[in-house]
Amino acid sequence: AWELTILHTNDVHSRLEQTSEDSSKCVNASRCMGGVARLFTKVQQIRRAEPNVLLLDAGDQYQGTIWFTVYKGAEVAHFMNALRYDAMALGNHEFDNGVEGLIEPLLKEAKFPILSANIKAKGPLASQISGLYLPYKVLPVGDEVVGIVGYTSKETPFLSNPGTNLVFEDEITALQPEVDKLKTLNVNKIIALGHSGFEMDKLIAQKVRGVDVVVGGHSNTFLYTGNPPSKEVPAGKYPFIVTSDDGRKVPVVQAYAFGKYLGYLKIEFDERGNVISSHGNPILLNSSIPEDPSIKADINKWRIKLDNYST
C-alpha cells in the first residue's frame, strides 16, 4: 500500500493576512486565524512529518480584499509560489479582471501547473493562452505518479468576465476523456481538483470513471468528522464518501473558505491504484499555530503598498 497526503485550500479570496474568526479584518491578533504565514507553518510541519504530500488549491484565490484590488493577482502567484503549491484549479473569480488579468499576473508567474479540463480557448486567444493552463498534469510523488485533472464552474461566463474566446464545457463531459488519457499513460491514481461546487463534486465522483478523489471548491462547503472546532456547521463528514456508478467509494473534500482551514486528507492506495482507505479533517488555522516569521516578513513588505493605498 502507498499513502498520499493531500493538503488543500479553496476560495481563499485574498485572505493573505490573518483574519478574525468570521474571516473579516483581524482586530485582536491573539484570536486571529488563517493567513499564508500561518498556513505555511502548518504545511511545512506536515511536509516534514510525512513523505508523500501534495498541496493543492481548488480555485478562487482572486477577489475579496484590498490585496487583490491593489496587486491584481501578483500577490497570489508570489505567495502560492512561496508556499510551494503543487497545483491549482481555475475558479470563476480568476476571470474577474478578464483573461489578461489571469494570464499576466498568475498564469505566467505561477511555478505550479494551473488546471482546467473544461475550459477551451478559441480564436486568437487559443495560441496566446496555449500551455499556460492545462487540462491535467502528472505529478511525481516519491516513486509514484499522481494525475491531477482540473475543472471550473461552467457558470463562469455569468459569474465573471472570461470574454468570448473561452468556452466552458460541461464538467463531466470534459473530464472523462482526460481521465481516460491519464489511464492510457498508466497513471492509476487520479485526483479531480476543481471549482464547481459540492453538488458537482459529488456528481463527478459518481459519474467520471477513474477518478479516485475529488477536491473541490466554490460552494465554501465545510465538512468535518467529529466535533467541529469553530463556528462552521458541517454539511457532512470529511471526507464525504460517494459511491460511483461503477461501485467504487470515492472521497470528496472541500475546506470551507478564506484560508481559515487547511484541508488534510490521507489516502491509502493499493498497488493497482485503488483507494483502500481515506481519512482526515480540515485543520483550523488558529493562533495556536504560529505565523512563519519569514513569510510574515514578506507579507509586511507587501503590506506597505496597501497602507499607502488606503491613506
Partner: antibody, heavy 122, light 107 residues
Framework: QVQLVESGGGVVQPGRSLRLSCAAS????????MHWVRQAPGKGLEWVAV????????YYADSVKGRFTISRDNSKNTLFLQMNSLRAEDTAVYYC???????????????WGQGTMVTVSS | DIQMTQSPSSLSASVGDRVTITCRAS??????LAWYQQKPEKAPKSLIY???SLQSGVPSRFSGSGSGTDFTLTISSLQPEDFATYYC?????????FGGGTKVEIK
C-alpha cells in the same frame, strides 16, 4: 538500494570536451530532478546544473552557462553532463545528486554519487 | 545570487561537546535550507532539509533551526564519527548556493 554511479571523468586539455554519465538505480529515476555538483581540490561544494524530472527545465550556474549541457535518458535511468570548452578552473570532482522531489521548485539533495574526477590540464 | 556565509570556517572540539555552526543567507530564504556532512575523499551526505527536518537514518544528536536569513546546525554531543566538514545550502532559488564549509576537528 538507491544508488548513483558517475563515470566519464579523466584528464583533458583546455578547450576540449568531456561527457560525464551518472547511472541511477533503486528508485523511479523519471520522478526526480537531478543535479550535478562539483568540488575543486581542497575547496567547497559548487552547484553546477539541474534538469527537472520531465526534462522541461534546466538551470545552470553562471560559471558553466553556455559551455555545459545537462541531459537525461529516463528510459536508461541515466543523467549526463556534456562539458565543452573546458578550462583549468573546471578541474574538480563531479557528483551527481538526486533532488528531494520538489517538483516545480528548487531542491536540496538526498542521494549523492561517489563522484568522478575531471582534470583540465595541458 | 544568494550568498551563504558559514561560521566558523573551522573549529576544534572534543568528543561529548555541544557544537554549533551558523549559516547566514544574504537574503531571506524562508526555511529552504539543507545541511550536509562530508568526510575526506567521500561524497557529501544529507543531514537536514527544510532547515530542521532530519534526513532518515541521521542520528538525533543532529538538529537544525532557523528561518529567513539565520540558521544553525547543532550537534548535541559530538561523537568520533562526526569529525568532518559541514556545508549549508539554500534551495530558495536558482542558482543553488552552498556555504563555504565548517571543518570540525579533534581538539
Amino acid at each position: 538500494q538507491v544508488q548513483l554511479v558517475e563515470s566519464g571523468g579523466g584528464v583533458v586539455q583546455p578547450g576540449r570536451s568531456l561527457r560525464l554519465s551518472c547511472a541511477a538505480s533503486g528508485f523511479t529515476f523519471s520522478n526526480y530532478g537531478m543535479h550535478w555538483v562539483r568540488q575543486a581540490p581542497g575547496k567547497g561544494l559548487e552547484w553546477v546544473a539541474v534538469i527537472w524530472y520531465d526534462e522541461s527545465n534546466k538551470y545552470y550556474a553562471d560559471s558553466v552557462k553556455g559551455r555545459f549541457t545537462i541531459s537525461r535518458d529516463n528510459s536508461k535511468n541515466t543523467l549526463f553532463l556534456q562539458m565543452n570548452s573546458l578550462r583549468a578552473e573546471d578541474t574538480a570532482v563531479y557528483y551527481c545528486a538526486r533532488g528531494y522531489n520538489s517538483r516545480w521548485y528548487p531542491d536540496a539533495f538526498d542521494i549523492w554519487g561517489q563522484g568522478t574526477m575531471v582534470t583540465v590540464s595541458s | 545570487d544568494i550568498q551563504m556565509t558559514q561560521s566558523p570556517s573551522s573549529l576544534s572540539a572534543s568528543v561529548g561537546d555541544r557544537v554549533t555552526i551558523t549559516c547566514r543567507a544574504s537574503q531571506g530564504i524562508s526555511s529552504w535550507l539543507a545541511w550536509y556532512q562530508q568526510k575526506p575523499e567521500k561524497a557529501p551526505k544529507s543531514l537536514i532539509y527544510a532547515a530542521s527536518s532530519l534526513q532518515s537514518g541521521v542520528p538525533s544528536r543532529f538538529s537544525g533551526s532557523g528561518s529567513g536569513t539565520d540558521f544553525t546546525l547543532t550537534i548535541s554531543s559530538l561523537q568520533p564519527e562526526d569529525f568532518a566538514t559541514y556545508y549549508c545550502q539554500q534551495y530558495n532559488s536558482y542558482p543553488l548556493t552552498f556555504g563555504g564549509g565548517t571543518k570540525v576537528e579533534i581538539k
